[in-house]
């Protein structure tokens, strides 16, 4: 004989079961009977905390009885078999189905054994992220928007950014009762350095195997930022032609480049070719300040550069050639 107390029967079930809104879910519940132990189960009962009566009963002689026959079904219990599996399937999950349920075995002679199971009703959210196109406002504004629609429980949204900024997150009821739509904005002071950079929206939800990452490429509209390159302070007479380049960063793209000098129109040796200015060889020293004026949809900005062409032995220097 085994020593007494070694062979008690135990009801096994998970403490929590997730199910999706509108789907079906099985609440697993089993009676574990040690090898030597004799037991006879006459009834299986499911009830919900806070509600009187049973929602599902399986009786050894009468079979199943349900409070909502179209929504409930014993998965394995059958007349004429040992009742060891009380697992119950619920169809068409509703928000109000969420709660604590008790699975009970009426066993002889050990007595009734039960376990509580928490049914969580989940809704998998749909996630989107989009850029909020902005101009240089000088104050914090939303530059990206991340929306997790129709989640239960509400999704958790965080942002990852090297650009600084802060989130502003809000919740609103979802389309389906009991669901929640979470909207999170990433807010910062727009600058040209931010344009084209990315931030990542991270959405976490217990229905996801892993967090969803949504990358947003930021758009900041700003007028041109202009500089002129190509001059190294070492230009000399009688050398090859040289080129100045008008470097402009802007969003949207520049629509036009206009070259001039502080004295007015370009001299004959300077020929404008869009963003570039071709400086032809000259035979006498010059000291001219060139102006590049760049236009885009938001305005025009300019840069100036003073160029000196000096006398000197061309063999010792690179001369005017900047190529």
């Amino acid at each position: 004989w085994p020593p007494p107390g070694t062979g008690d029967i135990v009801v096994q079930a998970p403490t929590q079961v997730p199910g999706f809104l509108g789907d079906s879910v099985t609440l697993p519940c089993y009676l574990q009977v040690p090898g030597m132990e004799e037991t006879h189960v006459s009834q299986l009962t499911w009830s919900r905390h806070g509600e009187s009566g049973s929602m599902a009963v399986f009786h050894q002689t009468q079979g199943p009885n349900y409070s909502e026959p179209k929504r409930l079904e014993f998965v394995a219990a059958r007349l004429g078999t040992e009742l060891r599996d009380a697992s119950l399937r619920m169809f068409g999950l509703r928000v109000e189905d969420e709660g604590n349920y008790t699975c009970l075995f009426v066993a002889f002679p050990q007595g009734s054994r039960s376990v509580d199971i928490w049914l969580r009703v989940l809704a998998k959210p749909q996630n989107t992220a989009e850029v909020q196109k902005v101009q240089l406002t000088g104050k914090p504004v939303p530059v990206a928007r991340c929306v997790s629609t129709g989640g239960r429980p509400p999704a958790h949204i965080t942002w990852h950014s090297d650009l600084g900024g802060m989130p502003n997150t809000s919740q609103a009821p979802g389309f389906l009762s009991g669901t929640v739509t979470v909207t999170s904005l990433w807010i910062l002071v727009p600058s040209s350095q931010v344009d084209g950079k990315s931030v990542t929206c991270k959405v976490e939800h217990e229905s996801f195997e892993k967090p969803q990452l949504l990358t947003v490429n930021l758009t900041v509209y700003y007028p041109p930022e202009v500089s002129i390159s190509g001059y190294d302070n070492n230009w000399y007479l009688s050398q090859n032609e040289a080129t100045l380049t008008c470097d402009a960063r802007s969003n949207p793209e520049p629509t036009g480049y206009n070259w001039s000098t502080t004295m007015g129109p370009l001299p004959p040796f300077a020929v404008a070719q869009g963003a570039q200015l071709l400086i032809r060889p000259v035979d006498k020293p010059i000291n001219t300040t060139f102006i590049c004026n760049v236009t885009n949809a938001l305005g025009a900005r300019q840069a100036e550069l003073t160029v000196q062409v000096k006398e000197g032995p061309p063999s010792e220097h690179s001369g005017m050639s900047s190529n």
Epitope: P3, G5, T6, M36, S42, Q110
Partner: antibody, heavy 121, light 109 residues
Framework: QVQLVQSGAEVKKPGASVKVSCKAS????????ISWVRQAPGQGLEWIAW????????NYNQKFTGRVTMTTDTSTSTAYMELRSLRSDDTAVYYC??????????????WGQGTTVTVSS | QAVVTQEPSLTVSPGGTVTLTCRSS?????????ANWVQQKPGQAFRGLIG???NRGPGVPARFSGSLLGDKAALTLSGAQPEDEAEYYC?????????FGGGTKLTVL
């Protein structure tokens, strides 16, 4: 109220069989567990077996396996215990007992008055 | 074969308290043994008192209580009445069979 009424005394010869009845009243017979217990003269109580009246499912004390059969007749709410190949040491008072639930636990709630079975040549 | 042992006899004064115990030959009695206690008064049928170690049957006076006391099952009678004079049997479950104790003859004197 709940009552178990057993059949009258029996005198049997060794090797014979005896069938003792236990008629239940005052409760739903088909949902009940009934145990059979005996007490030989000058001896202690000995559990024989139990039966679930609704399905006829049984569990026998291994000592009696093969020699005892328990049955029920749900139409008359009666439980039966048949003991075969009787020996002199089967002489005893045989009791039926209904198990009742107290909270979540079973107990030997109500007993029959007992049936004396005497095995003598 | 498991043997269940009880005190053969005990005496209690009216209004007094007495504890009957039930020992198992196989070791400590636990809740898995679902100890039962039944009473038999002279000339009367048996009557169930306790099931599942400590659960009183309906209609059983509150002066009867079941428990585990050390490695034994126990039935405590607090405030004994003359009508409590009877034979008390302990019953233990051993995985596939019930085993009865020899009984305790309780005298209220």
């Amino acid at each position: 109220q709940v009552q178990l009424v057993q059949s009258g005394a029996e005198v049997k010869k060794p090797g014979a069989s005896v069938k003792v009845s236990c008629k239940a009243s005052g409760y739903t017979f088909t949902s009940s567990y009934i145990s059979w217990v005996r007490q030989a003269p000058g001896q202690g109580l000995e559990w024989i077996a139990w039966i679930y009246a609704g399905t006829g499912d049984t569990n026998y004390n291994q000592k009696f396996t093969g020699r005892v059969t328990m049955t029920t007749d749900t139409s008359t709410s009666t439980a039966y215990m048949e003991l075969r190949s009787l020996r002199s040491d089967d002489t005893a008072v045989y009791y039926c007992a209904r198990h009742g639930l107290t909270g979540r636990h079973w107990y030997f709630a109500v007993w029959g008055q007992g049936t004396t079975v005497t095995v003598s040549s | 074969q498991a043997v269940v042992t009880q005190e053969p006899s005990l005496t209690v004064s009216p209004g007094g308290t007495v504890t009957l115990t039930c020992r198992s030959s196989t070791g400590a009695v636990t809740t898995s043994n679902i100890a039962n206690w039944v009473q038999q008064k002279p000339g009367q049928a048996f009557r169930g008192l306790i099931g599942g170690t400590n659960n009183r049957g309906p209609g059983v006076p509150a002066r009867f209580s079941g428990s585990l006391l050390g490695d034994k099952a126990a039935l405590t009678l607090s405030g004994a009445q003359p009508e409590d004079e009877a034979e008390y049997y302990c019953i233990l479950w051993y995985s596939n069979k019930f085993v009865f104790g020899g009984g305790t003859k309780l005298t209220v004197l």
